[in-house]
């Protein structure tokens, strides 16, 4: 049963999907494996707070501590990465704040910025001093656990020396790692003692061992790769938007709704209205009117602009966003003041939100 009655037939035109969605990211909290993470639920007046991770209820356990508005994760692991939400349940409504947790090793992002110093890793020995292989830069090998988002590039390094110059080969899960073992293969840069895998996928998860050897000995080092995936999810609305606003009669005002969605989002701006002097229909549900929605004839649906407002425009404005997975909505109040009273903006409203691709 829908939770409102529409005042008029709001049959929507078919949508013209954009080539890319205008999205803004939820806040991201990054932690290295083994670290502890504390996040405060950024919602006000919360009587009861409940937590979810990737849509599943999150309860306390030996590593997860929930105290009031705080979530603590002790000894974070890549499995803790995901989309988190805290929901504040109040007597009249509930509000949800979303954030991402990424337990990842930044070194494994695959940037080659540290490859410029590769020459120091390639140590030439005096030909008379025969020497078994040894590590030349153990600092670059300290992080054994690499948690990387899917589609990123991963680089593992084993800088070594020895005389004669050792050779390097790579194993995956203890077996010879062949090019055909992954789509797109991989690169080995012997100069830099590195293994590079581009656009990692879940099947790349596992243990990667570099074996460095010459005729005088062999050394090895193992890295563990975890590929962190994210499933598609319902839209996320940036906390605090739309923001409450006030203006004088005859003034103009804008409400902004910042949307983050994996899939085509459908945006509606809805207002509580009266019909025949009543705010509620015979079924007890409030009357709502769709003021604007995304579609062919709607530009910049994330912004609702009201011009030359009257006192009748005062009230609650709801930004409701849905995709095939689910929906989310947040609202703001418009206060309309008499002309002689100067408006006190409760929050600055920006007409052009910053969107991240």
């Amino acid at each position: 049963r829908p939770s409102f009655s529409l005042v008029e037939d709001t049959t929507l035109e078919p949508e013209e999907p954009p080539t890319k969605y205008q999205i803004s990211q939820p806040e991201v909290y990054v932690a290295a494996p083994g670290e502890s993470l504390e996040v405060r639920c950024l919602l006000k007046d919360a009587a009861v707070i409940s937590w979810t991770k990737d849509g599943v209820h999150l309860g306390p356990n030996n590593r997860t501590v929930l105290i009031g508005e705080y979530l603590q994760i002790k000894g974070a692991t890549p499995r803790d990465s995901g989309l988190y939400a805290c929901t504040a349940s109040r007597t009249v409504d509930s509000e949800t704040w979303y954030f991402m947790v990424n337990v990842t090793d930044a070194i494994s992002s695959g940037d080659d910025e540290d490859d410029t110093d590769g020459a120091e890793d390639f140590v030439s020995e005096n030909s008379n001093n025969k020497r078994a292989p040894y590590w030349t830069n153990t600092e670059k090998m300290e992080k054994r656990l690499h948690a990387v988002p899917a589609a990123n590039t991963v680089k593992f390094r084993c800088p070594a020396g020895g005389n004669p110059m050792p050779t390097m080969r790579w194993l995956k899960n203890g077996k010879e790692f062949k090019q055909e073992h992954r789509i797109g293969g991989y690169k080995v840069r012997n100069q830099h003692w590195s293994l590079i895998m581009e656009s990692v996928v879940p099947s790349d998860k596992g243990n990667y061992t570099c074996v460095v050897e010459n005729e005088y000995g062999s050394i090895n080092h193992t890295y563990h790769l975890d590929v962190v995936e994210r499933s598609p999810h319902r839209p996320i609305l940036q906390a605090g938007l739309p923001a409450n606003a006030s203006t004088v009669v005859g003034g103009d005002v804008e409400f902004v709704c910042k949307v983050y969605s994996d899939a085509q989002p459908h945006i509606q701006w809805i207002k509580h209205v009266e019909k025949n002097g009543s705010k509620y229909g015979p079924d007890g549900l409030p009357y709502l009117k769709v003021l604007k929605h995304s579609g062919i004839n709607s530009s910049n649906a994330e912004v609702l602009a009201l011009f030359n407002v009257t006192e009748a425009d005062a009230g609650e404005y709801i930004c409701k966003v849905s995709n095939y997975i689910g929906q989310a909505n947040q609202s703001a109040w418009l206060t309309v003041l008499p002309k002689q009273q100067a408006p006190g903006r409760e929050k600055e409203i920006t007409a052009s939100p910053d969107y991240l691709e």
């Epitope: 829908p2 949508e15 599943v56 209820h57 899939a263 095939y324 997975i325």
Partner: antibody
Framework: QVQLQQPGAEVVKPGASVKMSCKAS????????VHWVKQTPGQGLEWIGS????????SYNQNFKGKATLTADKSSSTAYIQLSSLTSEDSAVYYC???????WGQGTLVTVSV | NIVMTQSPKSMSMSVGDRVSITCKAS??????VAWYQKKPGQSPKLLIY???YRYTGVPDRFTGSGSGTDFTFTISNVQAEDLAVYYC?????????FGGGTKLEIK
């Protein structure tokens, strides 16, 4: 783990109605749409519609308006589809699926027969 | 309604072969396309979402590509257990529509 449980089969008479259930567990029921999909040998897969259990919002395929009614009960985490004025054309397997289509029920086989 | 035209309707392949199935949308759907595997007596299984993202636990021999109106689903190294009907679906605009399906048979 996430599960959607549906009854295995329903046999109904032409002209009658049938109401099928889809009980969800392992996730927060109110935060995902529940989709309903029809499968017939001739027609392949057809999306009937979806419901957002948190507020009861529904979206229907026009082809099923008047034929299918979607409801949800938050207290039992169960979604329902009611099919009315049944004919042999309605004999099919009806699946429910979570909003992301990553989890599906086993399907209910509806047979319309005298 | 957006029509998803899937081809071919059926194909017979040998183990180890590479299979490609195409899906053409009657209007642009950005990258809002999913691919499913449907085996007899089983529910559909999500393989690919958002055109190219492999769902959790799906083997990497399954890949998807494309955007706008033209989409391709590929099985790079067909296995005997891949015998099934494969469907594309657009989830951009309601009603969410499926392609007619491609039946993959193993020689």
């Amino acid at each position: 783990q996430v599960q959607l449980q549906q009854p295995g089969a329903e046999v109904v008479k032409p002209g009658a109605s049938v109401k099928m259930s889809c009980k969800a567990s392992g996730y927060i029921f109110t935060t995902y749409n529940v989709h309903w999909v029809k499968q017939t040998p001739g027609q392949g897969l057809e999306w009937i519609g979806s419901i957002y259990p948190d507020n009861g919002d529904t979206s229907y395929n026009q082809n099923f308006k008047g034929k299918a009614t979607l409801t949800a009960d938050k207290s039992s985490s169960t979604a329902y589809i009611q099919l009315s004025s049944l004919t042999s054309e309605d004999s099919a397997v009806y699946y429910c699926a979570r909003g992301d289509f990553a989890y599906w029920g086993q399907g209910t086989l509806v047979t319309v027969s005298v | 309604n957006i029509v998803m035209t899937q081809s071919p309707k059926s194909m017979s392949m040998s183990v180890g072969d590479r299979v490609s199935i195409t899906c053409k949308a009657s209007q642009g759907v950005s990258n809002d396309v999913a691919w499913y595997q449907k085996k007899p007596g089983q529910s559909p299984k999500l393989l690919i979402y958002s055109a190219s993202y492999r769902y959790t636990g799906v083997p990497d021999r399954f890949t998807g590509s494309g955007s706008g109106t033209d989409f391709t689903f590929t099985i790079s190294n067909v296995q005997a257990e891949d015998l099934a009907v494969y469907y594309c679906q657009q989830h951009s605009t309601t009603p969410y529509t499926f392609g007619g399906g491609t039946k993959l048979e193993i020689k």
